[in-house]
């Protein structure tokens, strides 16, 4: 029995209900009192959501998963999983029982963007050329983590002198803090390039140092 | 009919290895899933292995995982066991058996059975 | 140690009925189905109910089943003298990803 399912992840982000794809060919004459199907977790085996006796058995899985009970008779077996959480992330595996077996597993990958970057300086007054100071940028509740690029006004990456922690919530989203420490010339723009590498979402934030006083784009 | 007829039984010593054979007859072998189960002397039943109706899904109870293979040729209409590093709890009846509708195994051979004794 | 448990012995008198007991867990019975097969003195297993309760042709209405959350039963009515054999539960285990067996029952016809 063929199971086939997405071989890309399933991309879902915090919160927003997920459809994890499965389908199977009924052959001619297929009933619904034929089938049984389990859900699991593909690692731990942890039991998900199953379908027999010709009737759903229900979620095992914090009550957050549904069939799709008008397409099973058609081959469809995919899985709802609703209000998505960081701790959903892994493989689930579909296995299909009717007269012969057969299984596969879907991947998915959770994602939550990062908010717009906070910019912060230290020391934030009287700063002269050739004064040494930090510069913090601070995103917040994204998944997963994230790639932190700084540049100048002219583009030019800054690499040397820069910390990045990053930190989980207990939803599991990360908070970033973004470190430069920048010895400052006449006038500069410093920005910081916050990237979610599975949406591929860009959050941007610069600073602008003039002399005095300073701007905060 | 449909019938199952297993092969390839014997008497045998620790650590050696034997091939059990399943023929089967009397229906559209390629299309189902089948099974091994075996049961000790005077012991209940153990299911050992499954097989779908290709190949490409196959589970081992953990007590052969690793030492027994499961594995069929529908041109032969034959599913086949291949049994390594025997030990003497392996010692039983090997019952081949067709998949059915819920999990069920609605045909079973008459057996053959292994002895593995030093 | 059976994942399905089964009490080890049963007993009737010709006539009678006897009820046979199978308790599982929330990932074997109770997420998928349960069958039973019946072991006559030196023969192979046969199968006598699948899915809970549905018989396969020629098996006698005398045998019904049942199944109730994560527990199963097998009823035998106007118990008969050639129904003295070994009667197995078994479920397909979802979290163990195994067909799993009860340890079986002998019963006995008095």
């Known amino acids: 029995l063929e199971v086939q399912v997405p071989e890309d992840p399933v991309v879902a982000l915090v919160g927003t209900d997920a459809t994890l794809c499965c389908s199977f060919s009924p052959e001619p004459g297929f009933s619904l009192a034929q089938l049984n199907l389990i859900w699991q977790l593909t690692d731990t085996k942890q039991l998900v959501h199953s379908f027999a006796e010709g009737q759903d058995q229900g979620s095992a899985y914090a009550n957050r998963t549904a069939l799709f009970p008008d397409l099973l008779a058609q081959g469809n077996a995919s899985l709802r999983l609703q209000r998505v959480r960081v701790a959903d992330e892994g493989s689930f595996t579909c296995f299909v029982s009717i007269r012969d077996f057969g299984s596969a597993a879907v991947s998915l990958q959770v994602a939550a963007p990062y908010s717009k970057p906070s910019m912060t300086l230290e020391p934030n007054k009287d700063l002269r050329p050739g004064d040494t100071v930090t510069i913090t940028c601070s995103s917040y509740r994204g998944y997963p983590e994230a790639e932190v690029f700084w540049q100048d006004g002219q583009g030019v990456p800054l690499t040397g002198n820069v910390t990045t922690s990053q930190m989980a919530n207990e939803q599991g989203l990360f908070d970033v803090h973004s470190v430069l420490r920048v010895v400052l010339g006449a006038n500069g723009t410093y920005s910081c390039l916050v990237r979610n590498p599975v949406l591929q979402q860009d959050a941007h934030g610069s600073v602008t140092i003039t002399g005095q006083p300073m701007t905060f784009p | 009919e449909v019938q199952l007829l297993e092969s390839g039984g014997g008497l045998l010593q620790p650590g050696g290895s034997l091939r059990l054979s399943c023929a089967a007859s009397g229906f559209s072998f390629s299309s189902y899933g089948m099974h091994w189960v075996r049961q000790a002397p005077g012991k209940g039943l153990e299911w050992v292995a499954a097989?779908?109706?290709?190949?490409?899904?196959?589970y081992y109870a953990d007590s052969v995982e690793g030492r027994f293979t499961i594995s069929r040729d529908n041109s032969k209409n034959t599913l086949y066991l291949q049994m390594n590093s025997l030990r003497a709890e392996d010692t039983a009846v090997y019952y081949c058996?067709?998949?059915?509708?819920?999990?069920?195994?609605?045909?079973w051979g008459q057996g053959t059975t292994v002895t593995v004794s030093s | 140690q059976s994942v399905l448990t089964q009490p080890p012995s049963a007993s009737g008198t010709p006539g009678q009925r006897v009820t046979i007991s199978c308790s599982g867990s929330?990932?074997?019975?109770?997420?998928?189905?349960v069958n039973w097969y019946q072991q006559l003195p030196g023969t192979a297993p046969k199968l006598l109910i699948y899915?809970?309760?549905l018989r396969p042709s020629g098996v006698p209405d005398r045998f019904s089943g049942s199944k109730s959350g994560t527990s199963a039963s097998l009823a035998i009515s106007g118990l008969q003298s050639e129904d003295e054999a070994d009667y197995y539960c078994?479920?397909?285990?979802?979290?163990?990803?195994?067909?799993?067996f009860g340890g079986g029952t002998k019963l006995t016809v008095l």
């Open positions: 899915q809970s309760h």
């Open positions: 078994a479920s397909w285990d979802a979290s163990l990803n195994t067909w799993v």
């Open positions: 058996t067709k998949y059915y509708y819920h999990y069920a195994m609605d045909v």
């Open positions: 097989i779908n109706s290709d190949g490409s899904r196959i």
């Open positions: 929330r990932s074997d019975i109770g997420a998928t189905t």
